[in-house]
Structures are given as C-alpha cells and as structure tokens.
Amino acid sequence: EKLPKAPVITTPLETVDALVEEVATFMCAVESYPQPEISWTRNKILIKLFDTRYSIRENGQLLTILSVEDSDDGIYCCIANNGVGGAVESCGALQVKMKPKITRPPINVKIIEGLKAVLPCTTMGNPKPSVSWIKGDNALRENSRIAVLESGSLRIHNVQKEDAGQYRCVAKNSLGTAYSKLVKLEVEVFARILRAPESHNVTFGSFVTLRCTAIGIPVPTISWIENGNAVSSGSIQESVKDRVIDSRLQLFITKPGLYTCIATNKHGEKFSTAKAAATVSIAEWSKSQKDSQGYCAQYRGEVCDAVLAKDALVFFNTSYRDPEDAQELLIHTAWNELKAVSPLCRPAAEALLCNHLFQECSPGVVPTPMPICREYCLAVKELFCAKEWQAMEGKAHRGLYRSGMHLLPVPECSKLPSMHRDPTACTRLPYLDYKKENITTFPSITSSRPSADIPNLPASTSSFAVSPAYSMT
C-alpha cells in the first residue's frame, strides 16, 4: 500500500506567449498520493470548471484556453491539494501577443490654413506597435511643425497649403503591420486678393477693364460693386487657374464711379471675404455734355449690317475715344437686351436702335447726324413695342435699371424732329413703313397718347412683319 504523499509540482508553470484567437496551454504536473484536486486561478480569481472558454484535462493538470482574447492576459496559477500536508501552487504568466490593430483610424479633415490639425490613430497590439505616417507615397518626416504623438495621432501645427494631401497611419510590431485607409487633409485658405483693380482717369466713352485676382481654397467667387450696388452694366470675364481666380470687368465709361472687387469663399458655415476698390474718373467730364462732334463714314460693323442702308454714311461720335468700337459695343449690348422681346417688337426696335446709334450723316463742312423722324420712333414705341416700352418705363421708375438705362440707347421720341415739318431733317425707317389700315390689326395696344399722335406713315406694299430685311446673319 502506497504511503500518503503531499503534492509536489514537478513542472512549474512557465510564461506562455499566445496570439489572439489561438490556443494557449498551461501544464501543471503534480506528484502526490492520493491524487490531488487541482484548481486554477487567473489573477487570483478561480476559474470555474464549467467555463466553456477553458478546457481542463489530465485530472486538472492541463489548462487550455481555447481561443485566446486580449483580455486573457494575466497570471495563471494551479493549486494542488490532497489533504496531506499543505496545498502547493505554481504560477505563470500568459502574454497575449497581438498583431497591430488600428482601433481609431484617422478621418478626413478640413482645416483652415494656420490652425492646428490632429489626425487620430489609436492602436492595439502586443508588443505595443510603433506608429508612423505616410503622406501620398512617401514616409512622413517629423519636424518642428509635424509630430507623431505618443497616442499615435499626427499633429500638425500652423497648417500650410502644402500639408494638404492623402495620409494613412501605419502600426507595426514584430508580428505584423496594419494600415489605415487613406484619408484626405484639405487645407482651406481664406480669400485673399492678389491683384487689386487699378484706378483709371479716362475720357468719356472709353472702355476700361478692371482686373481683380484672388486666391483661396476653395477658389473664391468674385463679385463687383459699383458705387455700393451690384454692377448694372459691363461684361465680366472670369478664369480660374491653380486656385487663382482672375475676374475682368469691362466697362463702357459714361460716368465716374467707385468699383469694388469682393472675393468670397466658404469654410463650413462661415465665409471669408477680401475687398479692393478702384475709382474710375472721367477726364474732361464736361466734354460729353457739349454738342457732340464727329465724322461721317461707312458702317463697317456687324450688328446693324442687315438694318442700315448698305452704302449709307453714318455718324461717328468723337466724344468716344474709339467711336466705331464704342458705338458697336453699345448696339451689341442693346441687341442682347432685345432677345427677350416679342417677334413683333424686335425687328422694329432693332431698326430704331441701329438708326439712332448710327445716324445717317451729311458730310458737309460740319458732319451732321440726321436723327430718326419722330413719327417712326412713336410707331415703335406705341405700336410695335407698346408692351415692352411700358414695361421698361415701369422698371425705370422703380429704379430697377439704375444707371444701366444706357444699355438700351432709346431715343426720346418727343425730342425728335417731325417729318411733317421738314422731311429732309430726319431719317425714315423703311422697315417700319406699312399700310395705314394695318394699324388696326394690332390688338391689345393701348396708346399712352391720343390717337392723333399715331404716325401717319407712307403706305408700302411690303408688310413689316415679313420683310426679309429682318433676318439676322
């Protein structure tokens, strides 16, 4: 018969290294008689026999953790007791080894230039992973502005435009490497004016181009203000290259003004704005008020080609610096305004505007422009374009056109000479000739004047509405 023998642990527990989700086994070989009861603890807490995460075999001498989790880290002890002598204990550590894992990856960031940006990158792993960052395709170098914090996050002080780009963090230990997804750092820059418009002192009727260049991220928008209001006339051309917006406001100068360029861009819910102003003053301002002088020459332009008599001499007003060009731009601008009017009104208005801006001319010693006959002007105003004229006058009264009224250089009919008084003193508009009885065929025209003022124009066999002279080339 065997003699009773107190338990002796013949193979003390050792430190076990295990990867997450792998199996880890502690062996606790015991010699004793009678057979001991062996219990196991983790961090001094008893492991229950029915805990399905563990398997205890060989009379309790083998403890197997079936699928290691990172929380299984700790000190494991086996305690053997058979009632003979005292209980004996042996302990060993479980070190859960873990490939790097990024638990809080970086996210896309928009940041305003000059501020501080932090891109998070929290990691897990055993051994503790080292964290580095990649920008684009290259490893990111730390410097006085750029640092990788203990937590793994990337901190950039005083963010610059060149910091913009795609970043990813890299967590590395002896077991492997983990990469975050690419994230985008967008650096936003407040709108700033690079080139302010220049002030000009020009002659009446000159063309001036005001140029304003601004930079910012996002690319700013540029708007122009004339004497405190949105610019009512002129053409604006914009181009964008390399985040720089170049805006050119071309003006036909008939009055002095203060023009302000406003560059604006948006950062989240906030806007940043930069402004620059220039004055346009008119040299010899009184010149335009005097009786205009000019010269007679053939019309070489395009807009009124189909309207003006082919070989007629027209008057060019030398109060403009380049009369031919100035008058052509005026008519071109007016022509565009006419795109919205009715088919009945448009050819009549075109004939009126062209003959008003390019008046027939008698060369003589003093070149003399011949204005349109009052009756033809009234025909356009009160018959062909009655609705449009009333609408335009209404807008003018409500101040909708402000200084932009010159875009439609319409004559004041009442100030024009009558062809009944002196037929040689004014120009007829042949396109508007129509049979007197045709007047009654225009419904819904309400004249603002007595019917006696409706022109008595010469009868003609051609109907205004179908004259081929109105087709535009």
Partner: antibody, heavy 121, light 112 residues
Framework: ELQLVESGGGLVQPGGSLRLSCAAS????????MSWVRQAPGKGLEWVSA????????YYKESVKGRFTISRDNAKKTLYLQMNSLKSEDTAVYYC??????????????WGQGTLVTVSS | QAVVTQEPSLSVSPGGTVTLTCGLS?????????PDWYQQTPGQAPRGLIY???SRHSGVPSRFSGSISGNKAALTITGAQSEDEADYYC????????????FGGGTKLTVL
C-alpha cells in the same frame, strides 16, 4: 507682352487641306477682331479673311470663299483658318493679325511672324 | 473688283520728305475707305503705321503722317531716316455688295 503665334503651315498637295492656328497672348483676345493676311513669296500683302470679337460674322476674299473657313475659340484664345481644296496660288506666308477694335474690319495693329503654306505636287 | 494702286518704288534722301499715295483704279479714296498704312522690312512681319486716314498707331514716330489728298490717300514721311527704308502698303476698306479689305501692291521706299 502681346504675342500672336501661327502654326499649322507646311507642304500640302493641290486639293489637300490644312488648318492654321494662331495662339494669342498678352491681351484680352475676345475684345478684338482678327484677320488672316497672306503674302506669296516676293509679292505683296493680300487680305484673306476677318472675324469680329464675338465670332458672330465671317468675311472672306472672293477667291477663297467656300474653301476657307475662319473661326475663333475665345476660351482658348485661338484663331483658326481651315483651308480646303488648296490651290498652288494659295502658296504664301499666312499672317495672323489683330484688329485695333472689336469689329472685323479696320487697321491691323499687331501681327504674328507668319507660317508658310506650300501647295505643290 | 477695284484695284488699289501705289507707286512701285520711290526714293528719298536722309532728312528729306516723301509722299506715298494710294488710289483706286475706279473712283476716289474717301474717309469711308478708312485708309490704313503698313510698313514691312525684309524678313519681318508687317507693322501698322497709320489707321483711318490720319491716326498714328502707338509707338509710331511723328515723322509719319496720313491724309487724303485729292482723290488719294497719302502717307508722308518728313525727315526720312535710313531705318525707314522698307516696303509700304496701304489697306482700304471696300464695300461693293460685300465687305472687303484690299491692300495695294506696295511701294518700295529707298533712303539714298
């Protein structure tokens, strides 16, 4: 600095086609009319075609009408001359020239250095 | 089609005055032809001198002046200099059914 640079010239057989380009820089291209003018070797200047600032009309010398097409791309600051059904008498240096104003006709105040077109079999 | 006529060649002494003319084979040159004048030196592109009868292009010396004299356009060089030796072309705007621009045959100016 204002510059007009022509390209696209070369040797072509009678009946063939060429497209000349004129790249403009140093001025607001779409504020000016443009023209093509040619000069046969040892001869004088000959106006070929003109186009106003907005490309709204086109004008041609009678002998090239129906064969040549002038056009412009204001966004690209470029003037073009498409020449089809070329004849030996079209052999010349082709100059691109800028008008002093918007309309198609009038004084030419800036010229390119020209591109040579040779029509020969 | 009207032909624009110019003297084939002219000569002038340095410091002298010379007038080049530009006429039409049929009819007179008027301000409605907007006479323009161009200068071309060998191997170079033309250069604008005078536009619309009498206006000088920027950078053109004041010794060059334009006018209409009788039924012709005229370019006068007062105080000719050796660098003025060149070919001179006039250009006229023409309207006869369609718009046109016509150059004269050119005048070869020699400064002796």
């Amino acid at each position: 600095e204002l510059q007009l640079v022509e390209s696209g010239g070369g040797l072509v057989q009678p009946g063939g086609s060429l497209r000349l380009s004129c790249a403009a820089s140093g001025f607001t291209f779409d504020d000016y009319g443009m023209s093509w003018v040619r000069q046969a070797p040892g001869k004088g200047l000959e106006w070929v075609s003109a186009i106003p600032w907005n490309g709204g009309s086109t004008y041609y010398k009678e002998s090239v009408k129906g064969r040549f097409t002038i056009s412009r791309d204001n966004a690209k600051k470029t003037l073009y001359l498409q020449m089809n059904s070329l004849k030996s008498e079209d052999t010349a240096v082709y100059y691109c020239a800028k008008r002093s104003g918007r309309i198609a006709f009038g004084a030419l105040d800036a010229w390119g250095q020209g591109t040579l077109v040779t029509v020969s079999s | 089609q009207a032909v624009v006529t110019q003297e084939p060649s002219l000569s002038v002494s340095p410091g002298g005055t010379v007038t080049l003319t530009c006429g039409l084979s049929s009819g007179s040159v008027t301000s409605s032809n907007y006479p323009d004048w161009y200068q071309q030196t060998p191997g170079q592109a033309p250069r604008g001198l005078i536009y619309s009868t009498d206006s000088r292009h920027s950078g053109v010396p004041s010794r060059f002046s334009g006018s209409i004299s009788g039924n012709k356009a005229a370019l006068t060089i007062t105080g000719a200099q050796s660098e003025d030796e060149a070919d001179y072309y006039c250009g006229l705007y023409m309207y006869s059914g369609s718009k046109n621009y016509v150059f004269g045959g050119g005048t070869k100016l020699t400064v002796l």
